[in-house]
Every structure is written in structure tokens, then in C-alpha cells.
């Protein structure tokens, strides 16, 4: 639980951080946990502690293993662990998996590749970026503060993407890299205002005293993946989880994406054994996203049961 | 600068949940844990409990245990904080604010009210 | 938990004037790790948010006007505005920056006469 993974390169500078939070004056212990020996916080050392930041500098592959640190607070000291692990730099151009950061996805409106963990180190601009380790190179690339913008991103942008940069210590400067994979969404569809499907405007829906009724709202939204779209029923302008009638529940429908790339939702309005005060109500089926808010209102009546006699 | 942006001003009814948000930056996220505060009308400040941000491990004051949930998106650098089974006395003005020594940052407040 | 009891509850002073606020908390706030008094004071005026004036129970925030100043260590603490000004209206607590719950007094209300 309180434990987190770092990796690094071997000859480059590698900083973990303490996996326990604490205040600024707070002191932080770090040992060595297989032979309980103290880090110390001497700068002069390789490796050396300094508050919540443990400092490899640089890593060597024998660093690898479990460091504890214990943060000491009035009340009570929190433990924390970083599992440490130093890899051999790799001859070839290939990044393995276990190198590799979390996966950033990308579309042409949104090209932003943050370099991993670079906010725990002491570096100037500029970044250096790599793709698939050949240097990035054109306008089409712009290196801004902590993250790498890709202009006019294409399916052929995805790949491994490394950063580069200078980690400073007390006038000595050491080399980190990072590396994570990018992927490119298919930015071809497109939003549009809210349309309702079901049901109509100002709908009258014939319902059974004691029966179940459902009630469903459907509406699409445009094409392609939504950054922000929802349905949802109201009654009487307050939301369903408010009114606090268990009998009437929504419940989500099926994502559907039409032939036609539309993409649409379902909000299905479950009232079981419908009573009289039910025909009293407003019903509003809302679809909403970025563009707005649509809003078709139904009502209930009663369904005259059929007359057998006639 | 470091700012703490929350979420509008909500309006529930007795029995219900709220959750509200607070979106940091000017600062890196993960590198200080975050605190929920509340004030009643006319009343006192109440700490309701905090998160580690990076490990995502929560806190709570024995007063809400139960009842509040907090959570972090480390992604969108926000921290959440979720009351259920809301009465009338949850009538607050409720606050984030970062770890420190003190609070030295706070987030504008939203206000929540509990009516039926 | 720890109780904070602050006194008085308020006070009317005229500009100029040395202003004290009290705060006392039912446990010592003193951390013998790092000789930290784990204490914080705030002001707050209506309708605004909570101003950090002094954490460690003597050090002031960066930014806050000298004229404000806090003293004490354990369980008995002070905060002091050395020359009142108009603009320190405004209800001042303190904090329990020690241990959760982390507990605020039931504040002081500062006016001017």
C-alpha cells in the first residue's frame, strides 16, 4: 500500500521519492532495507538522502532494492517504501516494457507529452526529445517547459518518445531520461448539440395502475469518441437520486454507436407498481455535452384497461 | 502561483450526496497532501480529513468517518471530496487547502446547502 | 482529540492599540523531534477565505505585515497585532497543527472602536 516502483539507467541520476507525505518540517529517515543502514544526508555521497527525496547520483545497477523511509510526526512516524530498481543501459535502440512510463494518448487537438518525473529534478530548459531515439527535429515539434508539442498530430506520430535532460547538483550536472509510448486517437468524428430520439416533446405515455413502466431517453451527441456527454432523467426538476422514490430508478442503457458513427446513450426510467400520484409528475429527459442542454418532458396518463363487456 | 480552484456552489436535499472538486496548479501536485476544511454559518472551522496525493491514501476526522470520501486524480491534478447522507446542519461553506506547515494555501470555498 | 480555547471571543480595540488573542489546547503542541510548536494562527474576514498569518507559532507567513507576531510554546500561545491597523478587521484562529483531528479554535472577532 505504501509502496511505489522506480526505475532508472545506470551512470544517469535517478530521484525517488517517499511514498509518505508529510509536512515541510517534518524529518524523513532512509534506510537501506535489507541491511537497515542508514542513507546519509551528506551531499558528498552518491547516494544520499535529503528530506522526502532519496538522490542517486548517479544510479549504479547495485543500488536496485527496497529503501524504507519514515517520516517522523508528532503523533506517530508513517513508513513508506520505494522499490528501486537500476537497469544496464541498453546498446541497442529499443526501450524495453520495464523502462517504459504510463502510456499519454494524443489527437489532433491535444498533442501534449509530458516528460515522466521531471518535476523531481533540477533542470533548465530546453528539453531534448527523442522518437524511436532519432532526435525530433522540424517545426512541426516544440519543446515548452515540461512537455513536448506535437502540431498537427497523425496516426504515424504514435511511437516511443524519450526526454532528456540535465539533473544539477551543486555545479554538477548529470544526465536522466525518460521514456512512454504515445498513441494517436482518430479525431474524425465530431459534436454537436444534443438530439433526443425518445421520447417526443411534451410525450403522453400510457401507463397501468400497479404495472411496471419504463420509460427511456435516448440521445446522440455527434461522431466519434465524446469528450463530455450524459443522460438523465429528472422529475419534477430534481434529480433522481434526490427525490428519494426508491420504486422510480434510472438505469444506464447501452453505449450505441449507429451505423452511421453516431454515437448515442441510453437512460432507461424503471417505476415499478405505478401509482396514482406517478400521473402527477413532470418527466424530463436531459441530454446535455459541451454545446448544452436539451430537455424533452413527458407526462404519464392512465391506460383505461379494455373492456371485455364491450 | 499556486491556486486551488473548486467547484460552484451546490443545493441537495437532506439524504443526498455532494462532491466537490479542486483542481490545483502552479505547483506539482503529488508533492503535498490535501486538506478539506468546512464552516457552518457563524461557525467555527472544522478539518474534515486529507489525502496523500500521491499514493492516494486518505484520512479522516473522527467526525465524518463514514460519511466522507476523498479522493485525487493525479492526472487532472484535482482532489475530490465526496459527503453522503446530507443533513441540514452540512450547511457550509466547505474548503480544500494544502499540507504544510499551516495552511498557507487555500481554495475559494463552496458553499453547500442542505434543504429539503 | 485536542480541544483549542481562544479568548477573548472579541474585542474592540482603537487604532494604534497593542492587541493580544490567547489560545490555549488541552495537549502540548510541541514536537521534542524538532522543538516545533505545532501551532497555527489565521485571520479571516467575512466572507473571504482563511489567511495563513503564522505557522510553527512564531514564524510569519511571507507576506504578512511585521505588526503581527506570535509567541508561546506547549500548550499556551499568543498572537499579537503590536499597532492595530484598520484593515485587521477580521476574526482571528488558531490552529492545532499537531495531530489529527487537526483543530481549530472557536476564534477571535477583532473591531475597531
Known amino acids: 500500500k505504501f509502496s511505489k516502483q522506480s526505475w532508472g539507467l545506470e551512470n544517469e541520476a535517478l530521484i525517488v521519492r517517499c511514498p509518505r507525505q508529510g509536512k515541510p518540517s517534518y524529518t524523513v529517515d532512509w534506510y537501506y532495507s535489507q541491511t537497515n543502514k542508514s542513507i546519509p544526508t551528506q551531499e558528498r555521497n552518491r547516494v544520499f538522502a535529503s528530506g522526502q527525496l532519496l538522490k542517486f547520483l548517479p544510479a549504479a545497477v547495485a543500488d536496485s532494492g527496497i529503501y524504507t523511509c519514515i517520516v517522523r510526526s508528532p503523533t506517530f512516524n508513517r513508513t513508506g517504501y520505494a522499490n528501486v530498481t537500476i537497469y544496464k543501459k541498453q546498446s541497442d535502440c529499443n526501450v524495453p516494457d520495464y523502462l517504459m512510463y504510463s502510456t499519454v494518448s494524443g489527437s489532433e487537438k491535444n498533442s501534449k507529452i509530458y516528460c515522466p518525473t521531471i518535476d523531481l529534478y533540477n533542470w533548465t530548459a530546453p528539453l531534448e526529445w527523442f522518437k524511436n531515439c532519432q532526435a525530433l527535429q522540424g517545426s512541426r515539434y516544440r519543446a515548452h517547459k515540461s512537455f513536448l508539442v506535437i502540431d498537427n498530430v497523425m496516426t504515424e506520430d504514435a511511437g516511443d518518445y524519450t526526454c532528456k535532460f540535465i539533473h544539477n547538483e551543486n555545479g554538477a550536472n548529470y544526465s536522466v531520461t525518460a521514456t512512454r509510448s504515445f498513441t494517436v486517437k482518430d479525431e474524425q468524428g465530431f459534436s454537436l448539440f444534443p438530439v433526443i430520439g425518445a421520447p417526443a416533446q411534451n410525450e403522453i405515455k400510457e401507463v397501468e395502475i400497479g404495472k411496471n413502466a419504463n420509460l427511456t431517453c435516448s440521445a446522440c451527441f455527434g461522431k466519434g469518441t465524446q469528450f463530455l456527454a450524459a443522460v438523465l432523467w429528472q422529475l419534477n426538476g430534481t434529480k433522481i437520486t434526490d427525490f428519494g422514490e426508491p420504486r422510480i430508478q434510472q438505469e444506464e442503457g447501452q453505449n450505441q454507436s449507429f451505423s452511421n458513427g453516431l454515437a448515442c446513450l441510453d437512460m432507461v426510467l424503471r417505476i415499478a407498481d405505478v401509482k396514482e400520484e406517478d400521473l402527477l409528475l413532470q418527466y424530463d429527459c436531459l441530454a446535455l455535452n459541451l454545446h448544452g442542454l436539451r430537455r424533452h418532458t413527458v407526462r404519464l396518463s392512465r391506460k383505461n384497461p379494455i373492456d371485455h363487456h364491450s | 502561483q499556486v491556486q486551488l480552484v473548486q467547484s460552484g456552489a451546490e443545493v441537495k436535499k437532506p439524504g443526498a450526496s455532494v462532491k466537490v472538486s479542486c483542481k490545483a496548479s502552479g505547483y506539482t501536485f503529488i508533492n503535498y497532501g490535501m486538506n478539506w476544511v468546512r464552516q457552518a454559518p457563524g461557525q467555527r472551522l472544522e478539518w474534515m480529513g486529507w489525502?496523500?496525493?500521491?499514493?492516494?491514501?486518505?484520512t479522516y476526522g473522527d467526525n465524518f468517518k463514514g460519511r466522507v470520501t476523498i479522493t485525487r486524480d493525479t492526472s487532472a491534478s484535482t482532489a475530490y471530496m465526496e459527503l453522503s447522507s446530507l443533513r441540514s446542519e452540512d450547511t457550509a461553506v466547505y474548503y480544500c487547502?494544502?499540507?504544510?506547515?499551516?495552511?498557507?494555501?487555500w481554495g475559494q470555498g463552496t458553499l453547500v446547502t442542505v434543504s429539503s | 482529540d485536542i480541544q483549542m480555547t481562544q479568548s477573548p471571543s472579541s474585542l474592540s480595540a482603537s487604532v494604534g492599540d497593542r492587541v493580544t488573542i490567547t489560545c490555549k489546547s488541552s495537549q502540548s503542541l510541541l514536537y521534542s523531534g524538532n522543538q516545533n510548536n505545532y501551532l497555527a494562527w489565521y485571520q479571516q474576514k467575512p466572507g473571504k477565505v482563511p489567511k495563513l498569518l503564522i505557522y510553527g507559532a512564531s514564524t510569519r507567513e511571507s507576506g504578512v505585515p511585521s505588526r503581527f507576531s506570535g509567541s508561546g510554546s506547549g500548550t499556551d500561545f499568543t498572537l499579537t497585532i503590536s499597532s492595530l491597523q484598520p484593515e485587521d478587521v477580521a476574526t482571528y484562529y488558531c490552529q492545532n497543527d499537531h495531530s489529527y483531528p487537526y483543530t481549530f479554535g472557536g476564534g477571535t472577532k477583532v473591531e475597531i472602536k
Open positions: 489525502i496523500n496525493t500521491y499514493i492516494g491514501e486518505p
Open positions: 487547502a494544502r499540507e504544510g506547515d499551516g495552511f498557507a494555501y
